[in-house]
Amino acid sequence: SGRGEAETRECIYYNANWELERTNQSGLERCEGEQDKRLHCYASWRNSSGTIELVKKGCWLDDFNCYDRQECVATEENPQVYFCCCEGNFCNERFTHLPEAGGPEVTYEPPPTAPTLLT
């Protein structure tokens, strides 16, 4: 299931905890991984009393749950932290909640930002 060589990917980066982790708040992240490991992008968010709070976006290491997913779609019905992952450059720009049990699809569009590159 590996690709022989870790493919470099770029993902949208965001970190709500950027000050404490001493990183940029947002930008682009160049992904680096091990040989024979796949690389993914991800997004995670919380629903605080009806308000969607984006918490993190970036690169995600080899995870079979993310294989061959071109779009970032969270499928858990009502988690504490919504999580989606996908394969393809910047595939985590838009993210969607589409519960497996059925229910409305909700897609979140990113606000326009001037990205900075993180490595």
């Epitope: 995670s44 970036g58 690169c59 290491l61 080899d62 995870d63 749950n65 504490q80």
Partner: antibody, heavy 121, light 107 residues
Framework: QVQLVQSGAEVKKPGASVKVSCKAS????????MHWVRQAPGQGLEWMGI????????SYAQKFQGRVTMTRDTSTSTVYMELSSLRSEDTAVYYC??????????????WGQGTLVTVSS | DIQMTQSPSTLSASVGDRVTITCRAS???SNWLAWYQLKPGKAPKL??????SLESGVPSRFSGTGSETEFTLTISSLQPDDFATYYC?????????FGQGTRLEIK
């Protein structure tokens, strides 16, 4: 089932460093953040910091900033917590704890058995 | 940092009693709150998360309520195994903080 197995008890002298390990099994190691929490004798629980095993990024409580280093080895599904410049007040049971959620922090659904670190001259 | 204050610090009760432990946050934590049970020499055990969700495998006599700054853990009918120390924890924002603990002892 999820298991977190920590290294054994340590006795250290003031000024020394200690490195505690926590080996995870029963789940996808890189998918869930890992926390370190300690409990000093007769005291409550104190959060020390967090590591994201997927990328290795860390966040430490201000109290431990500059003295604590959390690392991980994805090949062995192990996280490490190193605390330097030990003093007697660092005598405590140190726990690793797995986060319940993916991609961000939340509560802890599995804990290691704890490692007693005693700092004494 | 968000301060978490539990009351009472110690609680004496008997088997079969209904007991309530309160946890107050110094600022809103929405419903990002968990409760843990600690026993000497054992790993802490998650009881409640997201203020009111019962962790899988935890007996239904445990329940949690509250939001924003005030939360309660209730044990509807105390069992011998429930005598322990209980901690609340907020995970609304870094740093994650715990209450000082409530020791539940046999009367």
């Amino acid at each position: 089932q999820v298991q977190l197995v920590q290294s054994g008890a340590e006795v250290k002298k003031p000024g020394a460093s200690v490195k505690v390990s926590c080996k995870a099994s029963g789940y996808t190691f890189t998918s869930y953040y890992m926390h370190w929490v300690r409990q000093a004798p007769g005291q409550g629980l104190e959060w020390m910091g967090i590591i994201n095993p997927s990328g290795g990024s860390t966040s430490y409580a201000q109290k431990f900033q500059g003295r604590v280093t959390m690392t991980r080895d994805t090949s062995t599904s192990t996280v490490y917590m190193e605390l330097s410049s030990l003093r007697s007040e660092d005598t405590a049971v140190y726990y690793c704890a797995k986060d319940q959620s993916r991609g961000w922090y939340s509560n802890f659904d599995s804990w290691g058995q704890g490692t007693l670190v005693t700092v004494s001259s | 940092d968000i301060q978490m204050t539990q009351s009472p610090s110690t609680l004496s009760a008997s088997v079969g009693d209904r007991v309530t432990i309160t946890c107050r946050a110094s600022q809103t934590v929405s419903n990002w709150l968990a409760w843990y049970q600690l026993k000497p020499g054992k790993a802490p055990k998650l009881l409640i998360y997201k203020a009111s969700s019962l962790e899988s495998g935890v007996p239904s006599r445990f329940s949690g309520t509250g939001s924003e700054t005030e939360f309660t853990l209730t044990i509807s009918s105390l069992q011998p195994d429930d005598f322990a120390t209980y901690y609340c924890q907020q995970y609304h924002s870094y740093p994650i903080t715990f209450g000082q603990g409530t020791r539940l002892e046999i009367k």
